[in-house]
Amino acid sequence: MRRGPRSLRGRDAPAPTPCVPAECFDLLVRHCVACGLLRTPRPKPAGASSPAPRTALQPQE
């Protein structure tokens, strides 16, 4: 599922870029894609450790 077209608005009024769960916003293609395509943090089993700042997945980012 993709985001609908933005409404026209001024340059100083940024439009939101929401993504559905399990999708993340790709800054280069400028639309939502499956998070797995973007090397996003992956949820891990309880007790697993990681060297990266792996917070809860935030698909809208």
Epitope: P14, T17, R39, T40
Partner: antibody
Framework: EVQLVESGGGLVQPGGSLRLSCAAS????????WNWVRQAPGKGLEWVGN???????YYNPSLKSRFTISRDTSKNTFYLQMNSLRAEDTAVYYC????????????WGQGTLVTVSS | DIQMTQSPSSLSASVGDRVTITCRSS???????????LHWYQQKPGKAPKLLIY???NRFSGVPSRFSGSGSGTDFTLTISSLQPEDFATYYC??????????FGQGTKVEIK
């Protein structure tokens, strides 16, 4: 843990060509964006370009006509083909992975030196 | 392209000093999704850069608490609250909001006084 290893640097004459390689381990290059960043001696960092999970490429506009990024997914390796090299292309070339949630360069290779000189 | 301007270009400081580096962008770095993709890297001679701070103020894993980032819009700051011997390096700000291209500041070299 993702690791990147560059190779292919060296001395090349002005007008010549060179291909750099970046071998990735610990992650597949079919996910994410895989970048080249260069640093001229004593200078700052300059983004060269990248190749995406789909094989799409993006370039620094100042370099696009001379530099080409490609990949071989079977080798989990991506490349930087540099043509019509100039003295000002002398730099350490780093490959780097991009975090797709926060959009920072989260993993870097060790760098490979390219010297363009006659 | 977005221009990133750091100041100062270099500074001399002593161990224990508080150090502040500023970074100014030519346009606001607030993305239409509400996020500000401004990051800070540390680089030591002969080594690849390392991420310190992401999205303005978030310390990367393993980065000491003496490093902090702040700012908004076009003006950002990296602060080292108490400079340690291992902190002598060059620091770069970088933006990923308006891409391509990804752009970096020219760097700030922190030297021993």
């Amino acid at each position: 843990e993702v690791q990147l290893v560059e190779s292919g640097g060296g001395l090349v004459q002005p007008g010549g060509s060179l291909r750099l390689s970046c071998a990735a381990s610990g992650d597949s290059i079919t996910s994410g964006y895989w970048n080249w960043v260069r640093q001229a001696p004593g200078k700052g960092l300059e983004w060269v370009g990248n190749i995406s999970y789909s094989g799409s490429t993006y370039y620094n506009p100042s370099l696009k006509s001379r530099f080409t990024i490609s990949r071989d997914t079977s080798k989990n390796t991506f490349y930087l083909q540099m043509n019509s090299l100039r003295a000002e292309d002398t730099a350490v070339y780093y490959c780097a992975g991009l975090d797709g949630l926060y959009w920072y360069f989260d993993v870097w290779g060790q760098g490979t030196l390219v010297t363009v000189s006659s | 392209d977005i221009q990133m301007t750091q100041s100062p270009s270099s500074l001399s400081a002593s161990v224990g000093d508080r150090v502040t580096i500023t970074c100014r962008s030519s346009q606001s770095l607030v993305h239409s999704n509400g996020n500000t993709y401004l990051h800070w890297y540390q680089q030591k001679p002969g080594k690849a850069p390392k991420l310190l701070i992401y999205k303005v103020s978030n310390r990367f894993s393993g980065v000491p608490s003496r490093f902090s980032g702040s700012g908004s819009g076009t003006d950002f700051t990296l602060t080292i609250s108490s400079l340690q011997p291992e902190d002598f390096a060059t620091y770069y700000c970088s933006q990923s909001t308006h891409v391509p291209p990804f752009t970096f500041g020219q760097g700030t070299k922190v030297e021993i006084k």
